[in-house]
């Protein structure tokens, strides 16, 4: 829906101002070369056309150069995330140049005015890059622009305007209002760098989407579906500070993109993987855990360059805090029904037992409904590395834990009043690990007892590496 900004939501940018009020904007943009991890240390200010500061501050022409670009600001000062990102970059890439693009005077405005300033700030960055390119040994290939929120679109403009092509742009939850559906040159886009990767953490289909919903890079990663981030609920926010407000929730979810990127820099031994999928619902069903044909990738700094003909939307689940990595599993459960049970919505839980650890009891999220006499696919994820899986406990929740479940039971009974013995049969569970891509088959511990009903459980042991069973032909519905 149209964003509620400005007349018709339209920017009064330079092309559309009456000629009389067009003025040459004196860009309030400063380039701060951070020479230390210490946020108190001021660093050096680079000045277009002045080579001395480059030498005095030890600018390394052959090293990687990061430009960090902040977004709209209500406070007018740098926020904490920026210092964390500077520090993480210095930790990971010791010789790199880390430049903070300070456009605070132009960003500390009404949102609409800050949006109008993105073009001129992008142009300033491009001019700085054009000047640096005149120096021996400086290569745009080594330039990585990292833009948060509105800063992601500034990075897009910079990549658009520069003479040549920058190596990489990372968009950290690019701003949505006034950019959703915008022309390819009026927002971050895959054309703006050799590789454009994007993290979307605050997208909403209903109401105002602070982050852009549409894909704008070569790869667009939507952690937790790109909307509700774990640890950012009102309860979490209320619990972690004296006062919790909707504003804090918004900040938590929007800023999560930055922290995921920081995590990828400092916890490189615990990389988070994302999986290509057409939409969030299919991912929630566990359909998309393939790594074939570049269908999975590390997120954040460690993302591998992918320049597909078409944009790639990728999904993953995360923990509520650093390290964000979780372990994804696809579970395929073939459900048999020997009785016509009508519409049935069981509440299943699984516990996974591995060589390193056992999982908590994990709910099997039913995205649509359980198909009877068919294979149902689920996504489960654990916060710890379980090692090699050994066995699985499957539980059908018994006595109703909620009014919703009570209603489900009543509805099920009303549709089948003469079938009180609700029962399903499950002979085996096929599991695929997203992180290792290993496939395993688990068979019912007691082959004579494969039935499960409310309040009961079934145990499955690993019976095979891979998914194909002996004497098994193409998958057909197996009935007794």
């Amino acid at each position: 829906s149209p964003t509620p900004f400005g007349p018709e939501g339209q920017l009064e940018d330079e092309l559309h101002k009456p000629k009389a009020i067009q003025t040459e904007v004196k860009p309030s943009v400063r380039f701060n070369l951070r020479t230390s991890k210490d946020p108190e240390h001021e660093g050096c200010y680079l000045s277009l056309g002045h080579s001395q500061p480059l030498e005095d501050c030890g600018f390394n022409m052959t090293a990687k150069t990061f430009f960090i670009i902040h977004g709209w600001t209500m406070s007018g000062i740098f926020e904490n995330w920026l210092h964390k990102l500077v520090s993480a970059l210095h930790t990971r890439e010791k010789d790199a140049n880390v430049v903070v693009v300070d456009w605070l005077p132009l960003a500390h405005q009404l949102y609409t005015d800050a949006v109008n300033n993105t073009r001129v700030v992008g142009h300033s960055i491009a001019r700085m890059l054009d000047w640096l390119q005149e120096k021996d040994d400086f290569s745009l290939e080594n330039v990585h622009l990292i833009g948060y929120s509105l800063g992601a679109h500034v990075a897009g403009y910079a990549g658009n305007f520069v003479k040549g092509t920058v190596g990489r742009i990372t968009g950290l939850d690019p701003a949505g209002p006034m950019f959703e559906g915008a022309d390819i040159h009026k927002r971050l886009s895959p054309d703006d760098a050799d590789f454009v990767d994007v993290l979307h953490t605050y997208t909403r289909s209903f109401g105002l989407s602070i982050g852009i919903q549409m894909p704008v890079g070569h790869i667009d990663i939507y952690p937790n579906g790109g909307d509700f981030q774990p640890g950012c609920g009102l309860n979490d926010v209320l619990g972690s500070m004296a006062y919790g407000t909707i504003t804090e929730v918004v900040k938590c979810e929007h800023e999560r993109a930055v922290h995921l990127f920081v995590d990828s820099l400092v916890n490189q031994d615990k990389p988070s993987f994302a999986f290509q999928c057409t939409d969030s619902n299919r991912f929630k069903k566990g359909i998309c855990l393939s790594c074939r044909k570049n269908r999975c990738n590390s997120i954040g700094y460690n993302a591998k360059k992918m320049r597909n003909k078409r944009n790639s939307k990728m999904y993953l689940k995360t923990r509520a805090g650093m390290p964000f990595r979780v372990y994804h599993y696809q579970m395929k459960i073939h459900v048999f029904s020997y009785k016509n049970m009508g519409e049935i919505e069981p509440t299943f839980y699984v516990t996974l037992y591995g060589t390193n650890a056992d999982s908590q009891t994990l709910p099997l999220e039913i995205v649509e409904r359980i198909e009877q006499n068919a294979t149902n696919t689920f996504l489960v994820y654990t916060e710890e590395d379980l090692g090699d899986l050994l066995k699985i406990q499957l539980t059908w929740e018994g006595a109703s834990q909620s009014w919703y479940n009570l209603w489900k039971e009543l509805r099920s009974y009303l549709s089948q009043p003469h079938n009180p013995g609700r029962e399903l049969n499950i002979r085996r569970i096929r599991v695929k690990s997203g992180e290792t891509q290993r496939k395993l088959t688990f068979c019912a511990e007691d082959p004579e007892n494969t039935s499960i009903s409310p309040g009961r459980e079934l145990w499955f042991r690993k019976c095979r590496d891979g998914w194909r069973m002996k004497n098994e032909t193409s998958p057909t519905v197996e009935l007794p």
């Epitope: 092309l15 520069v162 003479k163 559906g181 915008a182 022309d183 040159h185």
Partner: antibody, heavy 116, light 107 residues
């Protein structure tokens, strides 16, 4: 106000080249993409490509790759579109348009007739 | 390349009528669609951008809607000056592609 003024009509023989100009005024010429769109008689609109005058970056429609060249002269705020190896089906009105929200402002069009 | 299919290719309507033109993209273009109006012998004019935003100076009787692959241009009450050809264009990715056009004629 923003204005795009194009060069006059051209008549060319098959195999020849044509160079159409588009002079921009009323805005900062270097920072907005200018596209070329053509329209054959009685037909729809066809995007040929575009140029960003500041950096001279170009994007071309694959259909015209190798035959079309877009250039600019920042001193006169003018962009040029040259189409080579002309054939009769290149007979069309050629428009330049400056892009921001969409193709916000258009030139008046240049008629190019290819005939032996 | 993304194909944009417009329908109908032509329609006859009277002054005061409500007119709806549709455009279908061959793949998801989200809300990155613009609509143009062109009168005979004239250059096209931008009406709608980002699927639903009216461009400067465009009368409120023109409205756009849609997202994903299906888009609509609506003229709520057709005026004599609205008889023209209308084009949709996707501006999600390069190459930019136009629909084939819809000619709105007087009944």
């Amino acid at each position: 106000q923003v204005q795009l003024v194009q060069s006059g009509a051209e008549v060319k023989k098959p195999g020849a080249s044509v160079k159409v100009s588009c002079k921009a005024s009323g805005y900062t010429f270097t920072t907005y993409w200018i596209a070329w769109v053509r329209q054959a008689p009685g037909q729809g609109l066809e995007w040929m490509g575009e140029i960003l005058p500041g950096s001279a970056k170009t994007k071309y429609n694959k259909k015209f790759k190798g035959r079309v060249t877009m250039t600019r002269d920042t001193s006169t705020s003018t962009v040029y579109m040259e189409l080579s190896s002309l054939r009769s089906e290149d007979t069309a009105v050629y428009y330049c348009a400056v892009y921001d929200y969409g193709a916000d402002y258009w030139g008046q069009g240049t008629t190019v007739t290819v005939s032996s | 390349d993304i194909q944009m299919t417009q329908s109908p290719s032509s329609l006859s309507a009277s002054v005061g009528d409500r007119v709806t033109i549709t455009c279908k993209a061959s793949q998801d273009v989200y809300t990155a669609v613009a609509w143009y109006q062109q009168k005979p012998g004239k250059s096209p004019k931008l009406l709608i951008y980002s699927a639903s935003y009216r461009f400067t100076g465009v009368p409120s009787r023109f409205s756009g809607s849609g997202s994903g692959t299906d888009f609509t241009l609506t003229i709520s009450s057709l005026q004599p000056e609205d008889f023209a050809t209308y084009y949709c264009q996707q501006h999600y990715s390069i190459p930019r592609t136009f629909g084939g056009g819809t000619k709105v004629e007087i009944k």
